[in-house]
Protein backbone atom coordinates (compact mmCIF):
# COMPACT_ATOMS: atom_id res chain seq x y z
CA UNK A 1 0.00 0.00 0.00
CA UNK A 2 1.79 3.11 -1.22
CA UNK A 3 0.03 5.34 1.29
CA UNK A 4 1.82 3.63 4.14
CA UNK A 5 5.19 4.53 2.64
CA UNK A 6 4.44 8.23 2.67
CA UNK A 7 6.96 10.33 4.55
CA UNK A 8 6.01 11.33 8.13
CA UNK A 9 2.95 9.11 8.28
CA UNK A 10 2.83 7.28 11.59
CA UNK A 11 0.53 4.29 11.99
CA UNK A 12 -0.46 3.48 15.54
CA UNK A 13 -2.95 1.13 17.15
CA UNK A 14 -3.26 2.84 20.47
CA UNK A 15 -3.67 6.53 19.72
CA UNK A 16 -6.02 7.77 17.06
CA UNK A 17 -6.23 11.27 15.64
CA UNK A 18 -9.25 13.48 16.23
CA UNK A 19 -12.18 12.10 14.32
CA UNK A 20 -13.64 14.66 11.95
CA UNK A 21 -16.80 13.22 10.49
CA UNK A 22 -17.86 14.10 6.97
CA UNK A 23 -21.54 13.45 7.81
CA UNK A 24 -23.16 13.40 11.23
CA UNK A 25 -24.98 10.15 10.44
CA UNK A 26 -21.61 8.40 10.34
CA UNK A 27 -21.72 8.71 14.14
CA UNK A 28 -25.01 6.82 14.49
CA UNK A 29 -24.85 3.33 15.94
CA UNK A 30 -25.58 0.44 13.60
CA UNK A 31 -29.35 -0.01 13.67
CA UNK A 32 -30.75 -3.28 12.39
CA UNK A 33 -34.33 -1.96 12.56
CA UNK A 34 -37.37 -3.88 13.77
CA UNK A 35 -37.78 -6.18 10.77
CA UNK A 36 -36.46 -9.71 10.56
CA UNK A 37 -34.69 -9.98 7.22
CA UNK A 38 -31.01 -10.88 7.14
CA UNK A 39 -29.26 -8.43 4.86
CA UNK A 40 -25.53 -7.80 4.84
CA UNK A 41 -24.85 -4.08 5.09
CA UNK A 42 -22.00 -1.83 6.22
CA UNK A 43 -21.83 0.94 8.82
CA UNK A 44 -19.12 3.31 10.03
CA UNK A 45 -17.95 2.47 13.54
CA UNK A 46 -16.78 5.68 15.25
CA UNK A 47 -14.76 3.76 17.82
CA UNK A 48 -12.71 1.62 15.43
CA UNK A 49 -12.99 4.33 12.77
CA UNK A 50 -13.64 1.75 10.14
CA UNK A 51 -16.51 0.61 7.98
CA UNK A 52 -17.77 -2.69 9.30
CA UNK A 53 -20.33 -5.28 8.35
CA UNK A 54 -23.64 -5.68 10.20
CA UNK A 55 -26.91 -7.50 9.62
CA UNK A 56 -29.83 -5.25 8.69
CA UNK A 57 -33.41 -6.36 9.24
CA UNK A 58 -34.74 -4.75 6.07
CA UNK A 59 -36.75 -1.77 7.37
CA UNK A 60 -36.28 1.48 9.26
CA UNK A 61 -32.85 1.79 10.89
CA UNK A 62 -30.83 4.94 10.17
CA UNK A 63 -28.60 6.57 7.55
CA UNK A 64 -25.43 4.89 8.80
CA UNK A 65 -26.10 1.95 6.50
CA UNK A 66 -24.48 1.25 3.16
CA UNK A 67 -24.85 -1.39 0.48
CA UNK A 68 -21.10 -1.78 0.03
CA UNK A 69 -17.86 -1.24 1.90
CA UNK A 70 -16.78 1.22 -0.77
CA UNK A 71 -19.89 3.37 -0.39
CA UNK A 72 -19.42 3.43 3.39
CA UNK A 73 -15.79 4.48 3.05
CA UNK A 74 -16.68 7.14 0.52
CA UNK A 75 -19.34 8.67 2.80
CA UNK A 76 -17.65 8.35 6.17
CA UNK A 77 -13.88 8.18 5.90
CA UNK A 78 -11.67 11.01 4.85
CA UNK A 79 -8.25 9.89 3.59
CA UNK A 80 -8.23 6.84 5.85
CA UNK A 81 -9.31 8.57 9.05
CA UNK A 82 -7.87 5.74 11.16
CA UNK A 83 -4.34 6.95 10.46
CA UNK A 84 -2.57 9.75 12.20
CA UNK A 85 -2.43 12.56 9.69
CA UNK A 86 0.99 13.52 8.41
CA UNK A 87 2.63 15.84 10.90
CA UNK A 88 3.43 18.25 8.09
CA UNK A 89 -0.26 18.88 7.46
CA UNK A 90 -2.53 20.95 9.63
CA UNK A 91 -5.84 19.22 10.31
CA UNK A 92 -8.91 21.23 9.44
CA UNK A 93 -11.32 22.28 12.10
CA UNK A 94 -14.91 21.12 11.67
CA UNK A 95 -17.10 23.80 10.10
CA UNK A 96 -19.16 24.18 13.26
CA UNK A 97 -16.14 25.65 15.11
CA UNK A 98 -16.73 28.81 13.10
CA UNK A 99 -20.37 29.23 14.07
CA UNK A 100 -21.18 32.02 16.52
CA UNK A 101 -22.17 31.15 20.07
CA UNK A 102 -25.87 30.35 20.10
CA UNK A 103 -27.71 29.99 23.40
CA UNK A 104 -30.87 28.76 21.69
CA UNK A 105 -34.27 29.85 22.90
CA UNK A 106 -34.63 27.89 26.15
CA UNK A 107 -33.86 29.07 29.67
CA UNK A 108 -32.00 26.19 31.24
CA UNK A 109 -28.85 28.36 31.35
CA UNK A 110 -26.35 25.54 31.34
CA UNK A 111 -22.66 26.41 31.26
CA UNK A 112 -21.19 25.32 27.94
CA UNK A 113 -18.13 26.23 25.88
CA UNK A 114 -17.80 27.47 22.32
CA UNK A 115 -14.89 28.26 20.04
CA UNK A 116 -14.58 32.00 19.47
CA UNK A 117 -13.08 32.46 16.03
CA UNK A 118 -12.16 36.08 16.83
CA UNK A 119 -10.02 35.25 19.85
CA UNK A 120 -9.10 31.76 18.52
CA UNK A 121 -9.94 30.39 21.95
CA UNK A 122 -12.64 28.35 23.59
CA UNK A 123 -14.80 30.41 25.91
CA UNK A 124 -17.64 29.85 28.33
CA UNK A 125 -21.23 30.74 27.45
CA UNK A 126 -24.71 30.06 28.78
CA UNK A 127 -26.72 27.56 26.76
CA UNK A 128 -30.48 27.46 27.19
CA UNK A 129 -30.92 23.72 26.68
CA UNK A 130 -32.57 23.57 23.25
CA UNK A 131 -31.84 24.60 19.68
CA UNK A 132 -28.56 26.47 19.31
CA UNK A 133 -25.83 25.01 17.10
CA UNK A 134 -22.99 22.50 17.17
CA UNK A 135 -20.36 24.96 18.43
CA UNK A 136 -21.40 23.86 21.90
CA UNK A 137 -19.29 21.69 24.19
CA UNK A 138 -19.87 20.32 27.67
CA UNK A 139 -16.29 20.94 28.82
CA UNK A 140 -13.52 23.36 27.98
CA UNK A 141 -11.26 20.38 27.21
CA UNK A 142 -13.66 19.05 24.59
CA UNK A 143 -13.89 22.43 22.93
CA UNK A 144 -10.12 22.87 22.86
CA UNK A 145 -9.54 19.38 21.55
CA UNK A 146 -11.99 19.79 18.70
CA UNK A 147 -11.57 23.43 17.72
CA UNK A 148 -8.40 25.04 19.07
CA UNK A 149 -5.00 24.78 17.43
CA UNK A 150 -2.10 23.34 19.36
CA UNK A 151 1.12 25.31 19.95
CA UNK A 152 2.43 24.56 16.46
CA UNK A 153 -0.80 25.28 14.68
CA UNK A 154 -1.89 21.65 14.83
CA UNK A 155 -4.95 20.27 16.51
CA UNK A 156 -4.02 18.15 19.43
CA UNK A 157 -6.86 15.97 20.59
CA UNK A 158 -6.84 12.21 21.04
CA UNK A 159 -10.57 11.86 21.20
CA UNK A 160 -13.13 9.93 19.28
CA UNK A 161 -16.45 11.64 18.76
CA UNK A 162 -20.00 10.49 18.97
CA UNK A 163 -23.30 12.08 18.25
CA UNK A 164 -24.61 13.58 21.44
CA UNK A 165 -28.35 13.38 21.90
CA UNK A 166 -28.29 16.58 23.93
CA UNK A 167 -28.02 18.87 20.97
CA UNK A 168 -26.98 16.60 18.18
CA UNK A 169 -23.50 17.94 18.33
CA UNK A 170 -20.48 15.87 17.66
CA UNK A 171 -19.27 15.54 21.20
CA UNK A 172 -15.95 13.99 22.03
CA UNK A 173 -15.84 11.04 24.36
CA UNK A 174 -12.40 9.81 25.34
CA UNK A 175 -12.18 6.17 24.41
CA UNK A 176 -8.57 5.71 25.40
CA UNK A 177 -7.81 2.85 27.71
CA UNK A 178 -4.28 1.92 28.81
CA UNK A 179 -2.52 0.72 25.70
CA UNK A 180 -2.19 -2.88 26.86
CA UNK A 181 -5.93 -3.28 26.44
CA UNK A 182 -8.32 -3.03 23.51
CA UNK A 183 -12.06 -2.77 23.83
CA UNK A 184 -14.14 -5.01 21.57
CA UNK A 185 -17.49 -4.76 23.31
CA UNK A 186 -20.44 -2.53 22.39
CA UNK A 187 -19.35 1.06 21.76
CA UNK A 188 -21.79 2.49 24.28
CA UNK A 189 -19.89 0.77 27.13
CA UNK A 190 -17.27 3.48 26.60
CA UNK A 191 -19.67 6.39 26.99
CA UNK A 192 -20.05 8.22 30.31
CA UNK A 193 -23.04 7.77 32.57
CA UNK A 194 -25.80 10.16 31.56
CA UNK A 195 -28.70 10.63 33.93
CA UNK A 196 -30.82 12.55 31.39
CA UNK A 197 -32.88 15.60 32.27
CA UNK A 198 -36.11 14.30 33.76
CA UNK A 199 -36.86 14.32 37.47
CA UNK A 200 -37.03 10.66 38.46
CA UNK A 201 -34.29 8.97 40.50
CA UNK A 202 -34.13 5.41 39.23
CA UNK A 203 -31.35 3.06 40.33
CA UNK A 204 -29.33 2.02 37.29
CA UNK A 205 -25.84 0.77 36.49
CA UNK A 206 -23.34 1.99 33.92
CA UNK A 207 -20.01 0.56 32.80
CA UNK A 208 -17.07 2.72 33.87
CA UNK A 209 -14.45 1.87 31.27
CA UNK A 210 -11.74 3.78 33.15
CA UNK A 211 -11.89 1.47 36.16
CA UNK A 212 -13.40 -1.49 34.30
CA UNK A 213 -16.36 -1.95 36.66
CA UNK A 214 -20.12 -1.52 36.63
CA UNK A 215 -21.14 1.27 38.94
CA UNK A 216 -24.53 2.51 40.18
CA UNK A 217 -25.95 5.86 39.13
CA UNK A 218 -29.27 7.67 39.37
CA UNK A 219 -31.21 7.83 36.10
CA UNK A 220 -33.73 10.62 35.64
CA UNK A 221 -36.18 8.50 33.67
CA UNK A 222 -35.68 9.91 30.19
CA UNK A 223 -32.91 10.72 27.74
CA UNK A 224 -29.40 9.61 28.57
CA UNK A 225 -27.57 6.99 26.56
CA UNK A 226 -27.36 3.23 26.21
CA UNK A 227 -24.73 2.77 28.91
CA UNK A 228 -27.65 2.25 31.25
CA UNK A 229 -28.57 -1.12 32.78
CA UNK A 230 -31.24 -2.15 35.25
CA UNK A 231 -28.92 -4.60 37.02
CA UNK A 232 -25.22 -4.99 37.66
CA UNK A 233 -25.32 -8.44 36.09
CA UNK A 234 -26.80 -7.08 32.88
CA UNK A 235 -24.14 -4.38 32.81
CA UNK A 236 -21.31 -6.86 33.34
CA UNK A 237 -22.71 -9.24 30.77
CA UNK A 238 -22.90 -6.50 28.14
CA UNK A 239 -19.65 -4.67 28.79
CA UNK A 240 -17.12 -6.51 30.93
CA UNK A 241 -16.44 -9.22 28.40
CA UNK A 242 -15.33 -6.66 25.85
CA UNK A 243 -11.79 -6.10 27.10
CA UNK A 244 -9.06 -8.01 25.32
CA UNK A 245 -5.39 -7.89 26.19
CA UNK A 246 -2.89 -7.46 23.42
CA UNK A 247 0.10 -9.77 23.82
CA UNK A 248 1.82 -9.02 20.55
CA UNK A 249 1.17 -6.97 17.48
CA UNK A 250 -0.33 -9.95 15.77
CA UNK A 251 -2.26 -11.80 18.46
CA UNK A 252 -4.98 -11.08 21.00
CA UNK A 253 -5.94 -13.12 24.04
CA UNK A 254 -8.96 -12.78 26.29
CA UNK A 255 -8.04 -11.85 29.81
CA UNK A 256 -9.65 -11.42 33.18
CA UNK A 257 -9.74 -7.74 33.71
CA UNK A 258 -7.37 -7.32 36.67
CA UNK A 259 -5.28 -4.22 36.27
CA UNK A 260 -2.75 -2.19 38.10
CA UNK A 261 -3.81 1.35 38.77
CA UNK A 262 -2.64 3.40 35.84
CA UNK A 263 -2.84 7.06 35.06
CA UNK A 264 -5.65 7.71 32.67
CA UNK A 265 -6.38 10.92 30.82
CA UNK A 266 -8.30 13.02 33.33
CA UNK A 267 -10.67 14.55 30.77
CA UNK A 268 -12.71 11.36 30.71
CA UNK A 269 -13.17 11.40 34.47
CA UNK A 270 -14.40 14.96 34.19
CA UNK A 271 -16.96 14.06 31.57
CA UNK A 272 -18.55 11.25 33.48
CA UNK A 273 -18.40 12.90 36.90
CA UNK A 274 -20.16 15.92 35.42
CA UNK A 275 -23.00 13.80 34.15
CA UNK A 276 -23.60 11.90 37.39
Amino acid sequence: DSEEDEEHTIITDTELPPLKLMHSFCAFKADDGPCKAIMKRFFFNIFTRQCEEFIYGGCEGNQNRFESLEECKKMCTRDNANRIIKTTLQQEKPDFCFLEEDPGICRGYITRYFYNNQTKQCERFKYGGCLGNMNNFETLEECKNICEDGPNGFQVDNYGTQLNAVNNSLTPQSTKVPSLFEFHGPSWCLTPADRGLCRANENRFYYNSVIGKCRPFKYSGCGGNENNFTSKQECLRACKKGFIQRISKGGLIKTKRKRKKQRVKIAYEEIFVKNM
Epitope: N62, P103, G129, C130, A165, N167
Partner: antibody, heavy 124, light 107 residues
Framework: QVQLQQSGPGLVKPSQTLSLTCAIS??????????WSWIRQSPGRGLEWLGM?????????DYAVSVKSRITINPDTSKNQFSLQLNSVTPEDTAVYYC??????????????WGQGTLVTVSS | DIQMTQSPSSLSASVGDRVTITCRAS??????LSWYQQKPGKAPKLLIY???NLQSGVPSRFSGSGSGTDFTLTISSLQPEDFAVYYC?????????FGQGTKVEIK
Protein backbone atom coordinates in the same frame (compact mmCIF):
# COMPACT_ATOMS: atom_id res chain seq x y z
CA GLN B 1 -55.05 33.40 30.70
CA VAL B 2 -52.82 33.81 27.64
CA GLN B 3 -54.53 34.05 24.27
CA LEU B 4 -53.50 34.56 20.66
CA GLN B 5 -55.91 36.26 18.27
CA GLN B 6 -55.21 36.13 14.54
CA SER B 7 -56.38 38.58 11.93
CA GLY B 8 -55.84 39.03 8.21
CA PRO B 9 -57.43 38.34 4.83
CA GLY B 10 -58.53 34.86 3.83
CA LEU B 11 -58.00 35.38 0.10
CA VAL B 12 -54.75 36.45 -1.58
CA LYS B 13 -53.98 36.67 -5.28
CA PRO B 14 -51.00 34.78 -6.73
CA SER B 15 -47.71 36.76 -6.71
CA GLN B 16 -49.06 39.07 -4.00
CA THR B 17 -48.11 39.23 -0.32
CA LEU B 18 -49.89 37.28 2.39
CA SER B 19 -50.09 39.34 5.61
CA LEU B 20 -51.36 38.07 8.95
CA THR B 21 -51.19 39.49 12.45
CA CYS B 22 -51.27 37.75 15.82
CA ALA B 23 -52.29 39.77 18.89
CA ILE B 24 -51.02 38.49 22.23
CA SER B 25 -52.92 38.93 25.48
CA UNK B 26 -51.65 37.75 28.86
CA UNK B 27 -47.99 37.57 27.79
CA UNK B 28 -45.44 39.84 26.15
CA UNK B 29 -44.01 39.56 22.66
CA UNK B 30 -40.70 40.61 24.28
CA UNK B 31 -40.80 37.76 26.80
CA UNK B 32 -37.42 36.13 27.31
CA UNK B 33 -38.98 32.73 27.94
CA UNK B 34 -40.96 32.37 24.72
CA UNK B 35 -40.60 32.44 20.98
CA TRP B 36 -43.42 33.45 18.65
CA SER B 37 -44.00 31.28 15.67
CA TRP B 38 -46.03 30.85 12.50
CA ILE B 39 -47.10 27.36 11.47
CA ARG B 40 -49.29 26.33 8.57
CA GLN B 41 -51.32 23.23 7.79
CA SER B 42 -52.43 21.91 4.46
CA PRO B 43 -53.69 18.50 3.38
CA GLY B 44 -50.65 17.89 1.19
CA ARG B 45 -48.00 19.14 3.58
CA GLY B 46 -49.32 18.44 7.08
CA LEU B 47 -48.14 20.81 9.82
CA GLU B 48 -45.24 22.95 8.65
CA TRP B 49 -43.24 25.34 10.81
CA LEU B 50 -42.51 28.56 8.92
CA GLY B 51 -40.44 30.59 11.34
CA MET B 52 -40.24 32.37 14.66
CA UNK B 53 -39.00 35.47 16.44
CA UNK B 54 -37.76 35.77 19.98
CA UNK B 55 -36.23 38.43 22.17
CA UNK B 56 -33.06 37.66 24.12
CA UNK B 57 -31.49 41.07 24.75
CA UNK B 58 -32.00 41.62 21.01
CA UNK B 59 -34.52 40.39 18.45
CA UNK B 60 -33.71 37.14 16.71
CA UNK B 61 -35.46 35.23 13.98
CA ASP B 62 -35.26 31.80 12.41
CA TYR B 63 -37.03 30.79 9.21
CA ALA B 64 -37.70 27.50 7.46
CA VAL B 65 -35.48 27.04 4.43
CA SER B 66 -38.51 26.36 2.22
CA VAL B 67 -39.78 29.93 2.66
CA LYS B 68 -36.65 31.79 3.79
CA SER B 69 -36.41 34.00 0.71
CA ARG B 70 -40.05 35.11 0.97
CA ILE B 71 -40.86 35.35 4.68
CA THR B 72 -40.64 38.11 7.27
CA ILE B 73 -41.86 37.85 10.85
CA ASN B 74 -41.85 41.11 12.78
CA PRO B 75 -42.67 42.05 16.35
CA ASP B 76 -44.74 45.12 17.21
CA THR B 77 -43.97 45.83 20.85
CA SER B 78 -46.28 48.84 21.06
CA LYS B 79 -49.30 46.70 20.17
CA ASN B 80 -47.93 43.49 21.72
CA GLN B 81 -48.34 41.53 18.53
CA PHE B 82 -46.31 39.93 15.75
CA SER B 83 -46.94 39.59 12.05
CA LEU B 84 -46.26 37.28 9.14
CA GLN B 85 -45.51 38.46 5.63
CA LEU B 86 -45.11 35.89 2.88
CA ASN B 87 -44.22 37.36 -0.51
CA SER B 88 -44.83 36.06 -4.03
CA VAL B 89 -47.46 33.55 -2.99
CA THR B 90 -48.65 30.74 -5.22
CA PRO B 91 -51.60 28.34 -4.89
CA GLU B 92 -49.15 26.02 -3.06
CA ASP B 93 -49.27 28.45 -0.14
CA THR B 94 -52.97 27.80 0.39
CA ALA B 95 -53.27 26.52 3.96
CA VAL B 96 -54.60 27.19 7.43
CA TYR B 97 -52.08 29.51 9.09
CA TYR B 98 -51.59 29.43 12.86
CA CYS B 99 -49.65 31.73 15.11
CA UNK B 100 -48.24 29.97 18.14
CA UNK B 101 -46.19 30.45 21.28
CA UNK B 102 -43.12 28.30 21.78
CA UNK B 103 -42.70 27.94 25.53
CA UNK B 104 -38.99 27.94 26.29
CA UNK B 105 -39.08 28.50 30.04
CA UNK B 106 -36.79 25.63 30.94
CA UNK B 107 -34.48 23.02 29.46
CA UNK B 108 -36.87 22.09 26.69
CA UNK B 109 -39.21 23.85 24.32
CA UNK B 110 -42.70 23.10 23.06
CA UNK B 111 -45.64 24.86 21.42
CA UNK B 112 -48.17 25.36 24.18
CA UNK B 113 -50.50 27.95 22.71
CA TRP B 114 -52.09 28.33 19.28
CA GLY B 115 -54.13 31.00 17.57
CA GLN B 116 -57.53 30.06 16.18
CA GLY B 117 -56.15 29.57 12.66
CA THR B 118 -56.82 31.49 9.45
CA LEU B 119 -57.62 29.71 6.22
CA VAL B 120 -55.72 31.56 3.50
CA THR B 121 -56.61 30.70 -0.08
CA VAL B 122 -54.30 31.80 -2.87
CA SER B 123 -56.36 32.19 -6.00
CA SER B 124 -57.00 34.71 -8.72
CA ASP C 1 -33.69 18.44 9.01
CA ILE C 2 -34.94 15.95 11.56
CA GLN C 3 -37.74 13.85 10.09
CA MET C 4 -40.41 12.74 12.56
CA THR C 5 -42.12 9.55 11.43
CA GLN C 6 -45.29 8.53 13.20
CA SER C 7 -46.77 5.07 13.18
CA PRO C 8 -49.32 3.93 12.52
CA SER C 9 -50.74 6.60 10.22
CA SER C 10 -54.23 5.55 11.31
CA LEU C 11 -55.78 3.05 13.69
CA SER C 12 -59.23 1.87 14.64
CA ALA C 13 -59.96 1.24 18.29
CA SER C 14 -62.85 0.87 20.69
CA VAL C 15 -63.71 2.83 23.81
CA GLY C 16 -61.69 1.41 26.69
CA ASP C 17 -58.82 0.19 24.49
CA ARG C 18 -55.20 0.97 25.26
CA VAL C 19 -53.72 2.86 22.34
CA THR C 20 -50.03 3.42 21.58
CA ILE C 21 -48.69 5.81 18.96
CA THR C 22 -44.99 5.97 18.19
CA CYS C 23 -42.84 8.74 16.81
CA ARG C 24 -39.36 8.04 15.48
CA ALA C 25 -36.86 10.84 14.90
CA SER C 26 -34.34 10.51 12.07
CA UNK C 27 -31.60 11.43 14.51
CA UNK C 28 -31.41 11.59 18.30
CA UNK C 29 -33.17 14.45 20.01
CA UNK C 30 -33.04 15.52 23.61
CA UNK C 31 -36.13 16.40 25.61
CA UNK C 32 -37.93 18.90 23.39
CA LEU C 33 -40.54 16.42 22.17
CA SER C 34 -44.24 17.10 22.60
CA TRP C 35 -47.57 15.53 21.58
CA TYR C 36 -50.74 17.22 20.30
CA GLN C 37 -54.35 16.28 19.69
CA GLN C 38 -56.27 17.92 16.84
CA LYS C 39 -59.96 17.74 16.10
CA PRO C 40 -61.51 18.86 12.79
CA GLY C 41 -61.61 22.63 12.35
CA LYS C 42 -59.64 23.27 15.55
CA ALA C 43 -56.04 24.16 16.37
CA PRO C 44 -53.85 21.42 17.82
CA LYS C 45 -54.00 21.05 21.60
CA LEU C 46 -50.92 20.31 23.71
CA LEU C 47 -51.08 17.00 25.61
CA ILE C 48 -47.52 16.11 26.59
CA TYR C 49 -44.35 18.22 26.66
CA UNK C 50 -40.72 17.43 27.45
CA UNK C 51 -41.29 13.78 26.40
CA UNK C 52 -43.32 12.76 29.44
CA ASN C 53 -44.84 15.78 31.21
CA LEU C 54 -48.62 16.02 31.21
CA GLN C 55 -49.95 19.45 30.29
CA SER C 56 -52.20 20.99 32.91
CA GLY C 57 -55.85 20.04 32.39
CA VAL C 58 -55.08 16.99 30.24
CA PRO C 59 -56.53 13.71 31.59
CA SER C 60 -54.04 11.33 33.21
CA ARG C 61 -54.93 8.55 30.76
CA PHE C 62 -52.50 10.27 28.38
CA SER C 63 -48.81 9.56 28.96
CA GLY C 64 -45.57 9.96 27.05
CA SER C 65 -42.25 8.16 27.16
CA GLY C 66 -39.10 7.52 25.17
CA SER C 67 -35.63 8.87 24.54
CA GLY C 68 -33.10 9.30 21.76
CA THR C 69 -34.99 8.59 18.56
CA ASP C 70 -38.05 6.65 19.76
CA PHE C 71 -41.00 8.20 21.54
CA THR C 72 -44.44 6.93 22.49
CA LEU C 73 -47.81 8.44 23.31
CA THR C 74 -50.10 6.09 25.21
CA ILE C 75 -53.80 6.46 25.91
CA SER C 76 -54.46 3.95 28.68
CA SER C 77 -58.22 3.72 28.19
CA LEU C 78 -59.64 5.34 25.09
CA GLN C 79 -62.63 7.64 25.65
CA PRO C 80 -65.19 8.84 23.06
CA GLU C 81 -63.67 12.34 23.06
CA ASP C 82 -60.20 10.96 22.23
CA PHE C 83 -61.04 10.16 18.60
CA ALA C 84 -58.87 12.68 16.77
CA VAL C 85 -55.55 13.13 14.96
CA TYR C 86 -52.37 13.06 17.08
CA TYR C 87 -49.06 14.73 16.20
CA CYS C 88 -45.57 14.68 17.65
CA UNK C 89 -43.32 17.74 17.44
CA UNK C 90 -39.60 18.27 18.03
CA UNK C 91 -38.16 21.64 19.04
CA UNK C 92 -34.67 20.29 19.63
CA UNK C 93 -33.15 21.24 16.30
CA UNK C 94 -34.04 23.75 13.65
CA UNK C 95 -36.14 23.54 11.65
CA UNK C 96 -38.89 22.62 14.09
CA UNK C 97 -40.63 19.57 12.64
CA PHE C 98 -43.89 17.67 13.14
CA GLY C 99 -44.82 14.07 12.59
CA GLN C 100 -47.29 13.42 9.77
CA GLY C 101 -50.09 12.56 12.20
CA THR C 102 -51.92 9.47 13.43
CA LYS C 103 -55.69 9.33 13.00
CA VAL C 104 -57.48 7.46 15.78
CA GLU C 105 -60.89 6.29 14.56
CA ILE C 106 -63.78 4.42 16.13
CA LYS C 107 -63.81 0.71 15.37
Amino acid sequence: QVQLQQSGPGLVKPSQTLSLTCAISGDSVSSNSAAWSWIRQSPGRGLEWLGMIFYRSKWNNDYAVSVKSRITINPDTSKNQFSLQLNSVTPEDTAVYYCARVNANGYYAYVDLWGQGTLVTVSS
Amino acid sequence: DIQMTQSPSSLSASVGDRVTITCRASQPIYNSLSWYQQKPGKAPKLLIYGVSNLQSGVPSRFSGSGSGTDFTLTISSLQPEDFAVYYCLQVDNLPITFGQGTKVEIK
